[in-house]
């Protein structure tokens, strides 16, 4: 039985040209996290595997950085980065948990999000 829940940063916004941290946290389960996949719509951004470490998709290497932790840092944001992001936790023995984050990249300085997830 899958008892875990995914907590995410929810809906966030950031300024064009800036950076943002995408964070998910799996709680309420003792399942072992074997791998976390980060996807943007239908694109694989990155994978963090318990044995192999991080793999960043080559087409995103210049703008995506691993971490902190199992999170993902997006840099040099453009308006095209606006959209849904998914953290997919592969666990044993529970199975797969998925979290959703919506990022809006804004042209001006009206972007607001929790300071805890912002890169100075």
């Amino acid at each position: 039985m899958m008892t875990g829940t995914i907590e995410t940063t929810g809906n966030i916004s950031a300024e064009k040209g800036g950076s943002i941290i995408l964070q998910c946290h799996l709680s309420s389960t003792t399942a072992q996290v074997t791998q976390v996949n980060w996807e943007q719509q239908d694109q694989l951004l990155a994978i963090c595997n318990a044995d192999l470490g991080w793999h960043i998709s080559p087409s995103f290497k210049d703008r995506v950085a691993p971490g902190p932790g199992l999170g993902l840092t997006l840099q040099s944001l453009t308006v095209n980065d606006t959209g849904e992001y998914f953290c997919i936790y592969h666990t044993y023995p529970d199975g797969t948990y998925t979290g959703r984050i919506f990022l809006e990249v804004l042209e001006s300085s009206v972007a607001e999000h929790g300071a805890r997830f912002q890169i100075p």
Epitope: L44, D51, L52, S57, Y92
Partner: antibody, heavy 118, light 107 residues
């Protein structure tokens, strides 16, 4: 250099058994999921079975479920496929394969031919 | 099971031609699509993984695109060593499934 070397293939009668082995070298075997893929003569590729790094997750194709057993010995850097109740349609070249991040096969062995015939 | 349909099943082309092979999944597989090249008597070789990522050591004339259900492998300028059979494979869910293959022959 990553190397995967299969052995154990050969001619066997229908209903018989074989055990394939795949000796791995050149990488940290215990960190990778491993798969078996087969190819019947003149045909395409067919996935057979997979096992994750610590053998906690194992999967089989429906066509071999209940007859084949995948296993691994991380201390010996070796992958196995025990094949029982073999049928003529199991005749194929069997490849062992390394699968990083559980998603793509980046290295294949040279293959070992299994022929099931009376 | 997810079915993978490749087209064409074979094609004839000349050195220098641009070649496109398509692969369609029976349901959305996000970007979990890989492409392999196989020559007679040899094991397959990984060309493209995760739909568009070029495997290390593979020439840049090979490229992959697509997401969801429709994917494409393109060889921008066919070379003599590229005459082979190409397979797509989904890794979205087990059982992992391959396309039927596309044989690229010399015209």
């Amino acid at each position: 250099e990553v190397q995967l070397l299969e052995s154990g293939g050969g001619l066997v009668q229908p209903g018989g058994s074989l055990r394939l082995s795949c000796a791995a070298s050149g990488f940290t075997f215990s960190s990778y999921s491993m798969h078996w893929v087969r190819q019947a003569p003149g045909k395409g590729l067919e996935w057979v079975s997979s096992i994750n790094s610590n053998a906690g997750t194992i999967s089989y194709a429906d066509s071999v479920k209940g007859r084949f057993t995948i296993s691994r010995d991380n201390s010996k850097n070796t992958l196995y496929l025990q094949m029982n109740s073999l049928r003529a349609e199991d005749t194929a070249v069997y490849y062992c394969a390394r699968v990083p991040y559980d998603y793509w096969i980046d290295y294949w062995g040279q293959g070992t031919l299994v022929t099931v015939s009376s | 099971d997810i079915q993978m349909t490749q087209s064409p099943s074979s094609l004839s082309a000349s050195v220098g031609d641009r070649v496109t092979i398509t692969c369609r999944a029976s349901q959305s597989i996000s970007s979990y699509l890989n492409w392999y090249q196989q020559k007679p008597g040899k094991a397959p070789k990984l060309l493209i993984y995760a739909a568009s990522s070029l495997q290390s050591g593979v020439p840049s004339r090979f490229s992959g695109s697509g997401s969801g259900t429709d994917f494409t492998l393109t060889i921008s300028s066919l070379q003599p060593e590229d005459f082979a059979t190409y397979y797509c494979q989904q890794s979205y869910s087990t059982p992992l499934t391959f396309g039927g293959g596309t044989k690229v022959e010399i015209k």
